[in-house]
Interface confidence: medium
């Protein structure tokens, strides 16, 4: 049979290297030789390229080499397939060389901020050494911050006569390190070069861009003064590398601005001892380039009633995240402060906090929380300068099986009954929320029985036992990840009871 007609002819001019055409050869049953017929020099010249490979995948491509490739030029390319039964020709295809030229990537040699120009970096590069002298080049510049994975792109063109191979990338974050890569193409071409090697550059530093401020209210002391722990951090979206030399804090009673106290610190928290009335606290951060905008927070009076609006709250784990959701009865509340810290018996030292706006849920990556640790999570509604009553729950980012089972005791042994009691597993050993307990018991040489009770129950009465019989009993505490047995206890039922 005649060979299949070559289809899907595609040509690329790897600039000043070769012109390679490829095609779909079809299902060949016998050896087929392909000849690529070309007219070039605007139809004035013609020549052939013949595949000489015996493997079918290499036979579906052929290359023409310098110096018989010029740009600009128009080519016709036709592929002939020949086997023992005859010759078949492809459709004639037409190519403008400048439309299919592909160059090497440019080389970025410098990425630098421009003195005195904020939020900008200048990229300097060398054009690919092999690039058409007669064509303009178009470029795509892609960039991302060092700790991001998603690229942003900007497209621009450069005139071939333009000696200035630079581009000013604007609208960036201050004092942030960026990763830059560049690719180019002949302006008329559909083929882009590969991406250049990546190069890093940093924007200029600015004054700090702002702070987020929070507080932890503690019970009033004997003298009526109340300790308030002030906490702050860089505003969301602030540059990761933003430097701060220190903080100015000032506070005053709501009723009297004349009683303003000021303080300086380089720490990221501060303990204030305030009177019982309401106060305003303000602060700024500063560095060698200036001050941040002011952050302000109202501290309510001790006797002030805070509003309540969260009706229900739950936590669940979904796709490597801990998700906390709540329902609110107040439609006008759209900002919430989330606090979370490990539930340990000692005073919490590592309180974390974050605000949420325009949503009634909060998510945190599982790996930002310790696995098998119980966290106390509180959500505070915020309305203007007022902070509402928090709703708190406990949650685990990742649950495991308890590291030990419940400590178990046997009480009130009777002829046919017994009470099994157990203690809660210490917090540090639970590794998850205990959802139930299972009591396993078995008469010596007899069949085993089990009974499951919910986690609020710490004792259980076994009935219908055999008199004067040895039993073994064990209690298992379970989390969603599985259960762990406590130590097994032996007991023997009585032979008779005083009540018999």
């Amino acid at each position: 049979a005649l060979p299949a007609k070559p289809e899907n002819i595609s040509c690329v001019y790897y600039y000043r290297k070769n012109l390679t055409c490829t095609w779909s050869p079809g299902k060949e049953t016998s050896y087929t030789q392909y000849t690529v017929k070309r007219t070039y020099a605007f139809g004035e010249k013609h020549d052939n390229c013949t595949t000489n490979s015996s493997t079918s995948e290499n036979r579906a491509s052929c290359s023409f080499f310098l110096p018989r490739i010029t740009i600009p030029d128009n080519y016709t390319i036709e592929v002939e397939a020949e086997n023992g039964d005859g010759v078949i020709k492809s459709h004639m295809t037409y190519w403008r060389l400048e439309n299919i030229a592909k160059t090497e990537p440019p080389k970025i040699f410098r990425v630098k901020p421009v003195l005195g120009i904020k939020r900008m970096i200048q990229i300097e590069w060398i054009k690919p050494e092999l690039a058409p002298v007669s064509s303009d080049l178009k470029y795509t510049l892609r960039f991302r911050t060092v700790n991001s994975t998603s690229w942003m792109e900007v497209n621009f063109a450069k005139n071939r006569k333009d000696k200035n191979q630079t581009y000013n990338l604007t609208g960036l974050q201050p004092f942030t390190e960026y990763v830059i890569a560049l690719r180019c193409a002949v302006k008329e071409s559909k083929f882009w070069s590969d991406w250049s090697q990546e190069k890093m550059g940093m924007t200029e530093e600015e004054a700090p861009c702002g702070l987020e401020l929070w507080r932890v209210l503690k019970p009033a002391e004997a003298d009526g003064r109340r300790p308030v722990r002030l906490l702050w951090k860089k505003a969301r979206g602030a540059p990761v590398l933003e430097k701060t030399l220190g903080y100015n804090i000032w506070y005053y009673p709501e009723s009297n601005t004349n009683l303003t106290e000021t303080m300086n610190t380089t720490n990221q928290q501060l303990e204030l001892h305030l009177g019982g009335e309401s106060f305003w606290v303000s602060m700024i951060s500063y560095n060698s380039l200036g001050k941040s905008p002011v952050a302000t927070l109202r501290i309510p009076a001790i006797q002030e009633k805070s509003f309540q609006c969260i009706e229900v709250m739950q936590a669940c784990v979904a796709e490597d995240q801990l998700v906390v959701k709540w329902q609110s009865s107040a439609l006008d509340v759209n900002t919430w402060m989330i606090e979370w810290f490990p539930d340990v018996d000692s005073e919490p030292t590592t309180l974390s906090w974050e605000s949420v706006s325009q949503a009634t849920n909060w998510t945190i990556q599982q790996d930002k929380l310790k696995p098998f640790w119980c966290y106390n999570i509180s959500v505070y509604p915020m309305l203007h300068d007022k902070v509402g009553e928090p709703y708190s729950i406990q949650a685990y980012a990742k649950e495991g099986v308890p590291s030990e089972g419940p400590e178990t005791k046997v009480e009130n042994i009777g002829v046919k009954t017994v009470t099994i009691t157990w203690k809660e597993i210490p917090k540090s050993e639970r590794k998850g929320i205990i959802c139930n307990y299972t009591i396993f018991y078995q008469a010596e040489g007899g069949k085993g029985f089990s009974k499951t009770v919910n986690s609020s129950i710490l004792q259980y009465g076994l009935e219908s036992l055999k008199r004067k019989t040895s039993y073994i009993v064990q209690v298992m505490a379970s989390t969603s990840a599985g259960g762990t047995n406590g130590t097994s206890i032996n007991f023997k039922t009585l032979s008779f009871s005083v009540f018999e």
Epitope: L66, P67, T70, I71, V133
Partner: antibody, heavy 121, light 107 residues
Framework: QVQLVQSGAEVKKPGASVKVSCKAS????????MNWVRQAPGQGLEWMGL????????DYNPQFQGRVTITADKSTSTAYMELSSLRSEDTAVYYC??????????????WGQGTLVTVSS | DIQMTQSPSSLSASVGDRVTITCQAS??????VAWYQQKPGKAPKLLIY???TEAQGVPSRFSGSGSGTDFTLTISSLQPEDFATYYC?????????FGGGTKVEIK
């Protein structure tokens, strides 16, 4: 800037071979064909052949076929022209010349300084 | 092979003269012709390619024209540094061939 630097003058006996080198700099060596042209004393220019350093492909003037071998070493950006079975009429200045513009192949845009080869018994 | 016949083989002219050199190809070579200038003891220098395109850095007094088989190099106003030998060359295909050269001398 583009530069082609050739090896020094040679004196050879008839029947011997000569190998002239041409070191390229200031451009991508594999991106341009390298030609060899000779000029006998007081005579015109005669094209001998070329090499494409990218793939080693050569193209020779049939007048020299079998006697001339053009090679290229990509690692050192150097082209070589070897002429064997020398005779007295091969006495000439031998030039390497880089292929020229995008839209004019076979134009000899940049030339080496030339190497005088004298064939004499 | 394509033969390139150049004329005249030599000419004498004065500074400021308009000089014309012609070259005839043995077959139709469209516009694939280049012109070179060579001074004694030096390598040739490319002036014109594709019959009429000036090479980089070549003074505008040099111009080329023609297509098919007949080609011309014109120096509009001869300068002292233009006294040299000029060669035409076809760049249609291999093998490349040159004209015999035209020596431009001071009158």
């Amino acid at each position: 800037q583009v530069q082609l630097v050739q090896s020094g003058a040679e004196v050879k006996k008839p029947g011997a071979s000569v190998k002239v080198s041409c070191k390229a700099s200031g451009y991508t060596f594999t991106g341009y064909a390298m030609n060899w042209v000779r000029q006998a004393p007081g005579q015109g220019l005669e094209w001998m052949g070329l090499i494409n350093p990218y793939n080693g492909g050569t193209d020779y003037n049939p007048q020299f076929q079998g006697r001339v071998t053009i090679t290229a070493d990509k690692s050192t950006s150097t082209a070589y022209m070897e002429l064997s079975s020398l005779r007295s009429e091969d006495t000439a200045v031998y030039y390497c010349a880089r292929d020229g513009y995008d839209d004019g192949p076979y134009t000899l845009e940049t030339w080496g300084q030339g190497t005088l080869v004298t064939v004499s018994s | 092979d394509i033969q390139m016949t150049q004329s005249p083989s030599s000419l004498s002219a004065s500074v400021g003269d308009r000089v014309t050199i012609t070259c005839q190809a043995s077959e139709d070579i469209y516009s694939f012709v280049a012109w070179y200038q060579q001074k004694p003891g030096k390598a040739p220098k490319l002036l014109i390619y594709n019959a009429q395109t000036e090479a980089q850095g070549v003074p505008s007094r040099f111009s080329g024209s023609g297509s098919g088989t007949d080609f011309t190099l014109t120096i509009s106003s001869l300068q002292p540094e233009d006294f040299a030998t000029y060669y035409c060359q076809h760049h249609y295909d291999s093998p490349l061939t040159f004209g015999g050269g035209t020596k431009v001398e001071i009158k």
